[in-house]
Amino acid sequence: SIPWNLERIIPAWQQTEEDSSPDGSSQVEVYLLDTSIQSGHREIEGRVTITDFNSVPEEDGTRFHRQASKCDSHGTHLAGVVSGRDAGVAKGTSLHSLRVLNCQGKGTVSGTLIGLEFIRKSQLIQPSGPLVVLLPLAGGYSRILNTACQRLARTGVVLVAAAGNFRDDACLYSPASAPEVITVGATNAQDQPVTLGTLGTNFGRCVDLFAPGKDIIGASSDCSTCYMSQSGTSQAAAHVAGIVAMMLNRDPALTLAELRQRLILFSTKDVINMAWFPEDQRVLTPNRVATLPPSTQETGGQLLCRTVWSAHSGPTRTATATARCAPEEELLSCSSFSRSGRRRGDRIEAIGGQQVCKALNAFGGEGVYAVARCCLLPRVNCSIHNTPAARAGPQTPVHCHQKDHVLTGCSFHWEVENLRAQQQPLLRSRHQPGQCVGHQEASVHASCCHAPGLECKIKEHGIAGPAEQVTVACEAGWTLTGCNVLPGASLPLGAYSVDNVCVARIRDAGRADRTSEEATVAAAICCRSRPSAKASWVHQ
Amino acid sequence: QDEDGDYEELMLALPSQEDSLVDEASHVATATFRRCSKEAWRLPGTYVVVLMEETQRLQVEQTAHRLQTWAARRGYVIKVLHVFYDLFPGFLVKMSSDLLGLALKLPHVEYIEEDSLVFAQ
């Protein structure tokens, strides 16, 4: 007798007495930037502080009637979803409410900025335990709102935002598009994207994961014991804010990067029907629904990686796309993808002291994406080994020559467009284990890393027949760090990682008479961290 | 996620004869003006003036005061609604859009963003 949304994110087998106890103490504090709330509701009574913060625009219309219960509706429901004693996710968590949305649910970027600054000031005046900020609101893309979120995140605050309800690319909205924010889309009881009238949940590369957001039962401001159902990405974000509060309550030392990686790792994968999303967004949208991760005591020390997509480069000949990891994360590999196949490859380069993944468009190309594999590994130290394009002669292997360094990724690019050249093999574990192999016209970049107990291996899967994509997955206990396409007779569109699966995409020429030598191969570099062991390359 | 979304970024410059009115404003604006791509969500008349990251607290207040002074000389009244410092240096100002060109020429200004609406989701 537990509502579907709570069962979905905290499966019964994983619930502990501590997690489900509404009277348990929590050192985590959640700040909610929303409408006013009814703090006397049975769900949240005694665990909500209404701050004196109020920065809202006037309501529209001369005849607008401020009815308290309507003014409080959105915020009360969300406060209940986060920490409600019965319908809440993190039942013991204390919550602070800041009013940045008026009775019509409208606010301003400036009001939100002042609210974020208020939180920062509170943090400076009275430092406390871990802080989570829930932003169940969205406006158009705002550089300054994203910057404020970034600065607050740098102080150790975890920000969770609604992806938006516009059935659109979340990257066009703020704070959803801020990289430092955990951005949440909404799914229903069938794990499908939420439709809201003619619109629905936002999607795309700026969404980190999805969470329940349809027909969510929670506190109603109509009366102090009333409940109602509401839908939206706000409700989804509130679930994730609750999960984050529970994670921090178990392990207050978790950083934003670790929280995000663990949310991604332990989410339920591949349950969303991606056909709901526009075709060009499907590859960019994460197919994962949030669940409460187990505690770090049970799963500590493993290599955690996620895929970060860049914005689309645009179609100009010299266009580039750049994907960045979070400051704490290490860029272990870089690949690229183009729907037309016209690209000049990818490389890792340093910009402002940070390694970034760069993809290069080619003449006649419609644009490229850079795909970074961003990982968390204690005491990791990486370097890039480059081999410039040889003007003539045999293929040039690039390997990791520093002691105890292992290959985690290969990148390659051409200075000039040469689609024929792209159809040459680039990496062959059977002949040169632990090496990136380029051909005479490509610059090859090997990503070589050292960390205690880091070991890696290449895993390949080839298809000789007609195919649009080839995949290879790292087995349990191993984490995908690098992904490349080794093309056969067809033009490679590129390669990218989806969770622990390497996807090689090709434009199939439809030739069924290919020899195995011409097979298109997806090559994954799979790594694991065994802190007691020495760094090593595992020969298959 | 994103460095710049679907965004209106405009370079505004004052006519040259107006530059001579105030010596301090004589350098060409390198700062940009940004506003929401969705026109219905824009709130013209309220602007967040964002200063360079290293700008000191005192310089933020001086910059806001300088803008008020320049505006007053042109017969405009502007209201500084809030000064930001804890997350980024800048200030929120209510003023005529006529003054944007002038504001973009202020020292330390990185960009100016027009205020816009956000909505409960």
Epitope: S1, P3, S20, P22, S69, I217, C223, Y227, M228 | -
Partner: antibody
Amino acid sequence: EVQLQQSGPELVKPGASVKISCKASGYTFTDYYMNWVKQSHGKSLEWIGDINPNNGGTSYNQKFKGKATLTVDKSSSTAYMELRSLTSEDSAVYYCAGGGIYYRYDRNYFDYWGQGTTLTVSS
Amino acid sequence: DIQMTQTTSSLSASLGDRVTISCSASQGISNYLNWYQQKPDGTVKLLIYYTSSLHSGVPSRFSGSGSGTDYSLTISNLEPEDIATYYCQQYSKLPFTFGSGTKLEIK
């Protein structure tokens, strides 16, 4: 048939504590909040508080905080109310009453009542 | 706390009469009001919830109405088994509060 069977009458001395029980049958125990209501002799009803049997979450009337503690034992479908530091003011009939659980969100009433437990505090 | 007032503490009526019991709240309670019946032996039953909704198994001669702060319970055709004390109860704000009760007797 739904039944809430309360424990029998209690005669206790001032300063002592007492624990009253309410055993539910005929319905799924976790589908209803368990409320407790006090009725002093010849007086009206006073709501003491409620408990959600799913997770033990409680709400109390401020007046009874520190006086009453509500608990449940899911395995036996029984709710308990402990009253401590008893005085003659606590002499009353105490009722348990089942009210609709939160996700049946139109159910803000006490559907089923126990027969009442008479508590007498006297030296 | 919201005060619930039942001004009539006792009421005498004849069998077959139409009886109205009133209840007022110290502030608006938006129809979040229930009515209960307590028989002389102490048994308590729910009659009406949310101002006017009849609880299952309750005879249709019972009805409720009201809004804002003023509410009433009506028994259209008084029967012998209706002899009891009737309480109103609000659930607009915690704590739940009850009226002082109206005792209904037969003339």
